[in-house]
């Protein structure tokens, strides 16, 4: 399988809520010993791999905002944590699962990036991730609204 | 803050049957790997198996034929049964919290356990 | 299974020095490996993750490197607190396994 990532730039004015959005594609094993975790954070382009380090999202790391569920189930991260940072991660029955951030600040800007971990009990982890950018603004020449820019190629890298 | 608490006897018989018990408090066991991790006296670290969130098991394949790994999420609480131990079996376990795609992040203290008769 | 072997056994140096320690793997692991450090009685504690990141609160002085079956560890400058023993682990695949450790001493 794959992630997709529809938008690879996302331009917001401060205050504003913005949703990033990534979605799997391809065959999606929903076998009996198959689960997902998915999860998102904040990263750097590294020298290394794009979504490589793993840094928070307001605080909260990674293991804070995962979803966790078998191929099929929609799912949502713990709410109360997530919600007191103005964030909400979830996922639905199709195969997309987004991050909802709430009253962006300039602080937001940066390098976003999905994970979604497919778990073969028995024989390995899979590995994919999508990334992209925020740009929060202000002042006169910031957007009313987000702004979305769709992704030139829209199949991540894929990285086992 | 998640902590681990490993607890179980620490002497026993030859050809009997480890158990082991694993508590975890200040967070939530649905989700992530629940992992055993064993280390003999003096020596490395080996890792027995986990129990999934969902219930789903793997095991180390020299242990397998010997491992039986167990959850109970109304107790939070996780646990291991070892059958036909020997002294080799004799070593300091484990529990520890893994997380796909990560790595072992919060350990219990570990408990020594040693089999002889 | 997939067969980690650090090397040296044992490493003796000065608080102040750089510490420089390997593991090799029997066959390609990515990056997806982990460091630990375990201090006598104590549990491991995770170091470095996907061979180069620092997990939360372990200091600068501590990195990683390295890629498919050659890999690093990094003390650029030894605290009293950091003579310990080191492992490895890889988690391409199952079963997870351990390197066999580095011990740090004193000189």
């Known amino acids: 399988f794959k992630v997709a990532t529809p938008y690879s730039l996302y331009v917001c004015p401060e205050g504003q809520q913005v949703t990033l959005t990534c979605r799997l594609l391809g065959p999606v094993d929903k076998g009996h010993d198959v689960t997902f975790y998915k999860t998102w954070y904040r990263s750097s382009r590294g020298e290394v791999q794009t979504c490589s380090e793993r840094r928070p999202i307001r605080n909260l790391t990674f293991q804070d905002l995962h979803l966790h569920h078998g191929g099929h189930q929609a799912a949502n991260t713990s709410h109360d944590l997530a919600q007191r940072h103005g964030l909400e991660s979830a996922s639905d029955h199709h195969g997309q699962f987004s991050i909802t951030m709430r009253n962006l600040t300039l602080l937001d800007s940066g390098l976003y990036c999905c994970l979604v971990v497919e778990i073969r009990h028995h024989h390995s982890e899979h590995r994919v991730h999508g990334a992209m950018e925020l740009q929060v603004q202000t002042g006169k020449d910031a957007p009313s609204n987000c702004v979305v820019y769709p992704s030139s190629s829209q199949d991540s890298e894929n990285i086992t | 803050q998640v902590q681990l608490q490993e607890s179980g006897p620490g002497l026993v018989k030859p050809s009997e049957t480890l158990s082991l018990t694993c508590t975890v408090s200040?967070?939530?066991?649905?989700?992530?790997?629940w992992s055993w991790i064993r280390q003999p006296p003096g020596k490395g670290l080996e890792w027995i198996g986990y129990i999934y969130y969902s219930g789903s098991t793997n095991y180390n394949p020299s242990l397998k034929s010997r491992v039986t790994i167990s959850v109970d999420t109304s107790k939070s609480q996780f646990s291991l049964k070892l059958s036909s131990v020997t002294a080799a079996d004799t070593a300091v376990y484990y529990c520890?919290?893994?997380?796909?795609?990560?790595?072992?992040?919060?350990w219990g203290q570990g408990t020594m356990v040693i089999v002889s008769s | 299974e997939i067969v980690l072997t650090q090397s040296p056994a044992t490493l003796s140096l000065s608080p102040g020095e750089r510490a420089t320690l390997s593991c090799r793997a029997s066959q390609s692991v990515s990056y997806y490996l982990a460091w630990y450090q375990q201090k006598p009685g104590q549990a491991p504690r995770l170091l470095i993750y996907d061979a180069f990141n620092r997990a939360t609160g372990i200091p600068a002085r501590f990195s990683g490197s390295g890629s498919g079956t050659d890999f690093t560890l990094t003390i650029s400058s030894l605290e009293p607190e950091d003579f310990a023993v080191y492992y490895c682990q890889q988690r391409i695949n199952w079963p997870l396994t351990f390197g066999g450790g580095t011990k740090v001493e004193i000189k």
């Open positions: 200040g967070g939530s066991i649905s989700s992530y790997y």
């Open positions: 520890a919290r893994d997380i796909p795609a990560f790595a072992f992040d919060i």
